[in-house]
Interface confidence: low
């Protein structure tokens, strides 16, 4: 069919340079050269339907599906995925081909499926089908460690079902709060699976292999500590093991500890106690409550009571599936060039998230800090005052979450000018977005004050470069104007910037920066 457009479907795989993911250098890191997906016409289908080769994507990989259309005139388009329509912004490349892209950041199960691209050109309408599937036969895995009681011993075993076999270590700390950070001198690490010393303040188990490092903290209620203002909450998924440690110190051994779930004593075999004398001859008791595989009915308030201390509780919530709770509405910020500012996302999640901050297709490490109210926060301050779109992406195996931020830097416009045989163009990225004026420089107007009222075409924010809006203005040249100097000026509330252009016959154009 003579009218059918020439279509090329390609896949671009983005290098996973996210230092927070912790991939070792022995992993294949994909080049960004486009891979041809061989778009072919689907036979016996109603309408014109092209089908691209199936794309099988690894979890957390980032890709772009791209269509290059060689067809005259403008095109409009619409992406549809799982019955939702997604925004589509075609642009033209240097070869004047229409380019339509779909970026999939950090591939997850929920992003797998059929992506339909509907394109309408002046000549014809057609559909392109991309099938994106998620790889399900991973050679390597890294699972969060969990605890088991050692048979016939008062000790905990740390288990992480990972491939390759992970190195398991206990991370112990006897201080409070900030001083228990990973590299603190108060932290002791033991590279072994079994832990007998269970009286410490802070106990974590970590597993690491080529995929990175995952840790699980032993949930603890300390009866000698002032209770938190909000009730501590522990989330678990159905089938996971539950471990809660209750700890109390008293001047002598004359006290006991008990666990209750919703005012009912725990069954025999669901707890065990250990005690020791500390260096100052006070008695430390710990009482573990444990369930080897939790069910929905294990949800509730677990209360540790002592005959010598006020009791304290924790709310254990059993969920079918992990979650990430946060507000996903996009946020716009406007700051001055030297103003200190950090993006911030507050969320509650289980299991713990892995996250990245992305700007201009570059991923940045993501740190998260637990707050006292059960929420966590991730901040990003390393924007270096670059305006544009910043993306926070989090996932935890069961859920994913993306939040968009736009950063605008208030500054006076900076003008870039270029000219061709038929037109002169000026663009600027100042903020607030500038307005334009064009002036003609002539004998009558040596200071370039003569307005050019016709042939000017302004495009406000017509291309979004990683979220940074650019304003441009184009002057269509008439024969009479050739050989003249013209001046384009962009102005906003912070100032004005101009550029002078010599309208010449085709060829190199001298650009004279106007002071």
């Amino acid at each position: 069919n003579q009218d059918l457009p020439v279509i090329k479907c390609v896949l671009i795989n983005h290098k996973n340079n996210d230092s927070s993911v912790g991939k070792s250098s022995s992993y294949p890191m994909v080049s960004e050269s486009p891979e041809d997906l061989g778009c072919a016409l689907r036979p016996q289908s109603a309408g014109t339907v092209y089908e691209a080769a199936t794309v099988e994507v690894d979890v957390s990989a980032s890709i772009t599906l791209q269509v290059l259309v060689d067809t005259p005139g403008n095109i409009s388009c619409l992406w549809v995925f799982k019955h939702s329509s997604l925004n589509c912004q075609p642009h033209f490349d240097v070869q004047n081909r229409g380019v339509v892209s779909m970026v999939i950041l950090k591939m997850t199960e929920t992003q797998a499926g059929e992506y339909l691209l509907f394109i309408q050109s002046e000549a014809t309408n057609y559909t392109i089908v991309f099938t994106v599937s998620i790889r399900n036969t991973l050679l390597f895995t890294l699972r969060r460690p969990y605890f088991r009681k050692m048979e016939n011993q008062d000790a905990l075993v740390c288990i992480s079902e990972s491939v390759p076999e992970p190195i398991v270590e206990w991370v112990l700390c006897d201080s409070q709060g900030e001083s228990c950070k990973e590299e603190s001198p108060a932290v002791v690490k033991k590279e072994e699976k079994v832990l007998h010393e269970l009286f410490g303040t802070d106990i974590r188990c970590c597993a690491r292999n080529e995929l990175g490092r995952e840790c699980t903290r032993l949930f603890t209620i300390d009866l000698n500590q002032t209770p938190q203002t909000t009730l501590p909450q522990l989330f678990l998924k159905v089938g996971e093991p539950l471990w809660i440690r209750c700890k109390a110190v008293h001047v002598n051994h004359g006290f006991g500890l008990t666990w209750e779930l919703e005012n009912k004593a725990l069954e025999e075999g669901s707890y065990f106690e250990m005690s020791t004398y500390s260096t100052n001859r006070t008695m430390i008791r710990i009482l573990f409550a444990f369930v080897s595989s939790v069910a929905r009915n294990d949800t509730g308030y677990y209360t540790c009571s002592s005959s010598k201390h006020p009791s304290q509780s924790a709310l254990v919530t059993i969920v079918e599936k992990g979650f990430i709770n946060a507000t996903n509405s996009s946020e716009d910020y406007e700051i001055d060039q030297y103003e200190e500012f950090c993006f911030s996302v507050r969320f509650k999640a289980y299991p713990q998230i892995r996250c990245t901050w992305t700007f201009s297709r570059k991923a940045f490490p993501c740190e998260q800090k637990a707050l006292d109210d059960g929420y966590s926060v991730s901040k990003f301050c390393n924007h270096k005052h670059q305006p544009g779109e910043y993306i926070f992406h989090a996932e935890n195996g069961d859920a994913q979450f993306t939040k968009m931020f736009t950063l605008n830097i208030r500054r006076k416009p900076q003008v870039l000018a270029e000219a061709s045989a038929s037109q002169a163009s000026c663009s600027s990225d100042g903020y607030p977005l500038p307005s334009w004026t064009w002036k003609k420089c002539s004998d009558k107007s040596p200071n370039c004050t003569e307005d050019i009222p016709e042939g000017v075409w302004n495009r406000k924010a017509n291309r979004k470069v990683f979220g940074q809006w650019v304003s441009s203005s184009t002057l269509n040249m008439s024969e009479a104007m050739k050989g003249f100097l013209v001046k384009c000026c962009a102005y906003n509330s912070l100032g004005t910037s101009c550029e002078t252009i010599l309208l010449n016959s085709p060829g190199p154009f001298p650009f004279i920066q106007d002071s």
């Epitope: 896949l11 294949p28 080049s31 891979e35 080769a53 794309v55 099988e56 990989a61 790889r135 995929l211």
Partner: nanobody
């Protein structure tokens, strides 16, 4: 089902070159991403290089970048590994591998569906 058979291994002096081949049986060779892995005595099997189904994307471990070149000829159902500037630490059994069941594979972890039997490369003076 794909059967993979490596050849081309042998003894070579440091600084020398060698080309490994991997012949694949089965008509679906061109629908798999292919790769080379190696295992030195007493060490774990490690990724060396991989190539996408069409041959347009290649991936290399840092230790071999600039020295090894992976390529494929889908018409001959054959995968190649051209190894230049060989070093003693390149001594290992080299395995050919096929991964992924569809035509395009994007992977940040080596995912292998079929393995070859291996061919020994010894770099020694």
């Amino acid at each position: 089902e794909v059967q993979l058979l490596e050849s081309g291994g042998g003894l070579v002096q440091p600084g020398g070159s060698l080309t490994l081949s991997c012949a694949a049986s089965g008509r679906t060779f061109s629908s798999y991403a292919m790769g080379w892995f190696r295992q030195a005595p007493g060490k774990e099997r490690e990724f060396v290089a991989a190539i996408s189904w069409s041959g347009s994307s290649t991936y290399y471990a840092d230790s071999v970048k600039g020295r090894f070149t992976i390529s494929r000829d889908n018409s001959k159902n054959t995968l190649y590994l051209q190894m230049n500037s060989l070093r003693a630490e390149d001594t290992a059994v080299y395995y050919c591998a096929a991964g992924g069941s569809t035509r395009v594979v994007v992977t940040t972890t080596p995912v292998v569906k079929y393995w070859g039997q291996g061919t020994l490369v010894t770099v020694s003076s």
